[in-house]
């Protein structure tokens, strides 16, 4: 399996009530808003054939999916959470930025592109989707990356 | 309550095909993983092979050309064939749950396990 | 494959012992390591996944700890219910693989 490195985050970052509050508040109303319950995106089959030691890699690349290509573009939603997670994401994913795998990584951004595909092809309740998944996102960060 | 209960004949002929049954309860088999793990009188655990929540499924390669893992969701029963059986495969058979959708490779909860004994 | 090589593979201890059993990784699984208890005729019980984190329901007598390639299991005051075997696994990839077994009898 591919060595990773750097691929760590301090567990004082999934410690803090507020903010651990704030993302499942917004997960919590964003999934009442989606009306497809039989996708999804965080689940077994996004760590199929992903050593453990490879999924922090792994979770930060759907992390800078979901701040890129959905929190950005929504926004304007889901107010006021949503001006308080993003930020708090966002940091995350910053601390992230040197987290690398040496060798091939081919196995893992397949999977991350299926979920990409999903989110896409799905569109708009695609995105809202990806939101109400963010109580998964934060505790597989903090599963894979702690 | 999580419950899994592994059934099947517990005498298998040589060169046959071993078939056994896993029936759960107290979960979805379209949730959980669900593996089988074997182990002989006196030895450790060998891990054998998974099917996934999605109906997919993962063998460990020293079985790959003999075994199959398929279920019935509608029974809620992951099942178990192992061909071309010898006298090695005489053991006690397990399934496991997973123990969520992360830790998918942690056995969370167990069958109480069924004996196989392959003789003529 | 990942072979998993514990010791000692058997141990007598008396209630209120404390014990500790370790388990060798033979390439580095990070902290993937889970710890289960086997008795007769009960189905396997994990106790410990992640190296250190405690299955619910696992009594807090009960540690692991190590990372990379050397694990161990610690039973802080043996129970009489703890006398059994003990199996360590690793859970980092395929195919998952378990040592040999640390049965523990009473003294």
């Known amino acids: 399996a591919p060595i990773s490195s750097h691929c760590r985050l301090d567990k004082s970052n999934f410690q803090q009530p507020y903010i651990t509050n704030r993302t499942f508040m917004l997960a919590k109303e964003a999934s009442l808003a989606d009306n497809n319950t039989d996708v999804r995106l965080i689940g077994e089959k996004l760590f199929h054939g992903v050593s453990m030691s490879e999924r922090c890699y792994l979770m930060k690349q759907v992390l800078n999916f979901t701040l890129e290509e959905v929190l950005f573009p929504q926004s304007d939603r889901f107010q006021p959470y949503m001006q308080e997670v993003v930020p708090f994401l966002a940091r995350l994913s910053n601390r992230l930025s040197t987290c690398h795998i040496e060798g091939d990584d081919l196995h893992i951004q397949r999977n991350v592109q299926k979920l990409k595909d999903t989110v896409k092809k799905l569109g708009e309740s695609g995105e809202i989707k990806a939101i109400g998944e963010l109580d998964l996102l934060f505790m597989s960060l903090r599963n894979a990356c702690i | 309550e999580v419950q899994l209960q592994e059934s099947g004949p517990g005498l298998v002929k040589p060169s046959q095909t071993l078939s056994l049954t896993c029936t759960v309860s107290?979960?979805?088999?379209?949730?959980?993983?669900v593996h089988w793990v074997r182990q002989h009188s006196g030895k450790g655990l060998e891990w054998m092979g998974r099917m996934w929540s999605d109906g997919d499924t993962s063998y460990n390669s020293a079985f790959t050309s003999r075994l199959t893992i398929s279920r019935d969701t509608s029974k809620s029963q992951v099942s178990l064939k192992l061909s071309s059986v010898t006298a090695a495969d005489t053991a006690v058979y397990y399934c496991?749950?997973?123990?969520?959708?992360?830790?998918?490779?942690?056995?969370?909860?167990w069958g109480q396990g069924t004996t196989v004994t392959v003789s003529s | 494959d990942i072979v998993m090589t514990q010791s000692p593979s058997s141990v007598s201890a008396s209630v209120g012992d404390r014990v500790t059993i370790t388990c060798k990784a033979s390439?580095?699984?990070?902290?993937?390591l889970a710890w289960y208890q086997q008795k007769p005729g009960k189905a396997n019980k994990l106790l410990i996944y992640s190296g250190s984190t405690l299955q619910s329901g696992t009594p807090s007598r009960f540690s692991g700890s190590g990372s990379s390639t050397d694990f161990t299991l610690t039973i802080s005051s043996l129970q009489p219910e703890d006398f059994a075997t003990y199996y360590c696994q690793q859970h980092n990839e395929y195919p998952l693989t378990f040592g040999q077994g640390t049965k523990l009898e009473i003294k």
């Open positions: 496991a749950r997973s123990l969520d959708f992360y830790y998918d490779t942690t056995l969370a909860f």
């Open positions: 107290g979960f979805s088999l379209t949730s959980y993983s």
């Open positions: 390439k580095t699984i990070s902290k993937y």
